[in-house]
């Protein structure tokens, strides 16, 4: 993929078209959050991305142009984690059941759930259509990508004293300059082909000593599987 390090996702690059086939856009008249397709009929996103009506857009690259690979499917069920806490953003995870099955192809496909927790130092891919400016507003039309490492839980907790639960982890750069941002929420953090994280929160975007905070999907695999089974 062409690399442009000036101001994407913040500090990322334009993803190669449809190179993140599990990435979805949640739309309510505008893109407001991302998500990840985990099977033909289910999407994982962030709990704080809850809205009563959501259209899930799959196969997107440029969200402002119909490019021919898109599938727009309304949400049939939107299930936020029962212990989601708006104040702390603990348990910031949500499942969306599509009203019809997605057609799986080269441009729309699923991502695997994790089989082990994220290991410190692992390089991950974060993607989304969120703000590309660390201050101000510059929302891209084309999907942005960022390669970033998993930080140790100690560094994560030191960056956000008293705010990091066991259901959260940090990914990014303590020096700042590269991070997810507003509009990336709910989107994927994929490490070694597994969905390890969901974009959740942070103190600003790309600020020094304030890395991005992500929901630890590994802790919710059982809940995800049970919820899908109970709603199939």
């Amino acid at each position: 993929a062409p690399f442009d390090d000036d101001d994407k996702i913040v500090g990322g690059y334009n993803c190669e078209e449809n190179s993140v086939p599990y990435q979805v856009s949640l739309n309510s008249g505008y893109h407001f959050c991302g998500g990840s397709l985990i099977n033909e009929q289910w999407v994982v996103s962030a709990g704080h991305c809850y809205k009563s009506r959501i259209q899930v857009r799959l196969g997107e690259h440029n969200i402002e142009v119909l490019e021919g690979n898109e599938q727009f499917i309304n949400a049939a069920k939107i299930i936020r984690h029962p212990q989601y806490d708006r104040k702390t953003l603990n348990n910031d995870i949500m499942l969306i059941k599509l009203s019809s099955r997605a057609v799986i192809n080269a441009r729309v496909s699923t991502i695997s759930l994790p089989t082990a927790p994220p290991a410190t130092g692992t390089k991950c891919l974060i993607s989304g259509w969120g703000n590309t400016a660390s201050s101000g507003a510059d929302y891209p039309d084309e999907l942005q990508c960022l390669d970033a490492p998993v930080l140790s839980q100690a560094k994560c907790e030191a960056s956000y004293p008293g705010k990091i639960t066991s259901n959260m982890f940090c990914v990014g750069f303590l020096e700042g300059g590269k991070d997810s941002c507003q509009g990336d929420s709910g989107g994927p953090v994929v490490c070694n082909g597994q969905l390890q994280g969901v974009v959740s929160w942070g103190d600003g975007c790309a600020q020094k000593n304030k890395p991005g905070v992500y929901t630890k999907v590994y802790n919710y695999v059982k809940w995800i599987k049970n919820t899908i089974a109970a709603n199939s």
């Epitope: 505008y30 704080h48 991305c49 009563s52 104040k87 507003a137 929302y139 507003q182 709910g186 929160w201």
Partner: antibody, heavy 125, light 107 residues
Framework: QVQLVQSGAEVKKPGASVKVSCKAS????????ISWVRQAPGQGLEWMGW????????NYAQKLQGRVTMTTDTSTSTAYMELRSLRSDDTAVYYC??????????????????WGQGTTVTVSS | DIQMTQSPSSVSASVGDRVTITCRAS??????LAWYQQKPGKAPKLLIY???SLQSGVPSRFSGSGSGTDFTLTISSLQPEDFATYYC?????????FGGGTKVEIK
């Protein structure tokens, strides 16, 4: 259906306080925020402040800082706006309006899709 | 603070006319702009959100466009019920700010 119903008109003396209520129905109160907007006679719209219904986080217009307090009561799905040390130029119609939450790294969009009917506050000696 | 400048402040038009109202932000706000219609003695009503998305129940003769700093509200064929005051609002950052309003009057 989704609606916001505000308390009735008030007449106050300069220096007094007023508290306007806004009762929400037809949606989950804590999934949204409430903004307060006022409109003086013959004038345009002036934003006063914003409150998260779930966390009670607030953001006030600078010119009203120290005089305005916004609160919510989640048990009754009601938002309140109190304005103190009233002056004659506070005479206006006060509106509450529903908007998106500002939370996490969700898209930051703070438009207002549902409005209350308005509460007339007259400040006169 | 982001200043919103609306023009014109008033426009006289006839039923069936195409009416265009512009709104300029003092700094870039991406697509985060809303348009409201207000009739005398009534609360504002949301017409357009996120610059170009039509609010449910609003007639398709209303449309919005723009991104960054320059935005437009267009009424393709003015109807008698459209005579009102229209406001833009930046929905990108606090403090929320409104344009000064455009009054659409009968010619």
């Amino acid at each position: 259906q989704v609606q916001l119903v505000q308390s009735g008109a008030e007449v106050k003396k300069p220096g007094a306080s007023v508290k306007v209520s806004c009762k929400a129905s037809g949606y989950t109160f804590t999934d949204y925020a409430i903004s307060w907007v006022r409109q003086a006679p013959g004038q345009g719209l002036e934003w006063m402040g914003w409150i998260s219904a779930s966390t009670a986080d607030t953001n006030y217009a600078q010119k009203l800082q120290g005089r305005v307090t916004m609160t919510t009561d989640t048990s009754t799905s009601t938002a309140y706006m109190e304005l103190r040390s009233l002056r004659s130029d506070d005479t206006a119609v006060y509106y509450c309006a529903r908007g998106d939450e500002v939370v996490g790294k969700r898209t930051y969009y703070i438009g207002m899709d549902v409005w209350g009917q308005g509460t007339t506050v007259t400040v006169s000696s | 603070d982001i200043q919103m400048t609306q023009s014109p402040s008033s426009v006289s038009a006839s039923v069936g006319d195409r009416v265009t109202i512009t709104c300029r932000a003092s700094q870039g706000i991406s697509r985060w702009l809303a348009w409201y219609q207000q009739k005398p003695g009534k609360a504002p009503k949301l017409l357009i959100y996120a610059a170009s998305s039509l609010q449910s129940g609003v007639p398709s003769r209303f449309s919005g466009s723009g991104s960054g700093t320059d935005f437009t509200l267009t009424i393709s064929s003015l109807q008698p019920e459209d005579f009102a005051t229209y406001y833009c609002q930046q929905a990108n950052s606090f403090p929320i700010t409104f344009g000064g309003g455009t009054k659409v009057e009968i010619k």
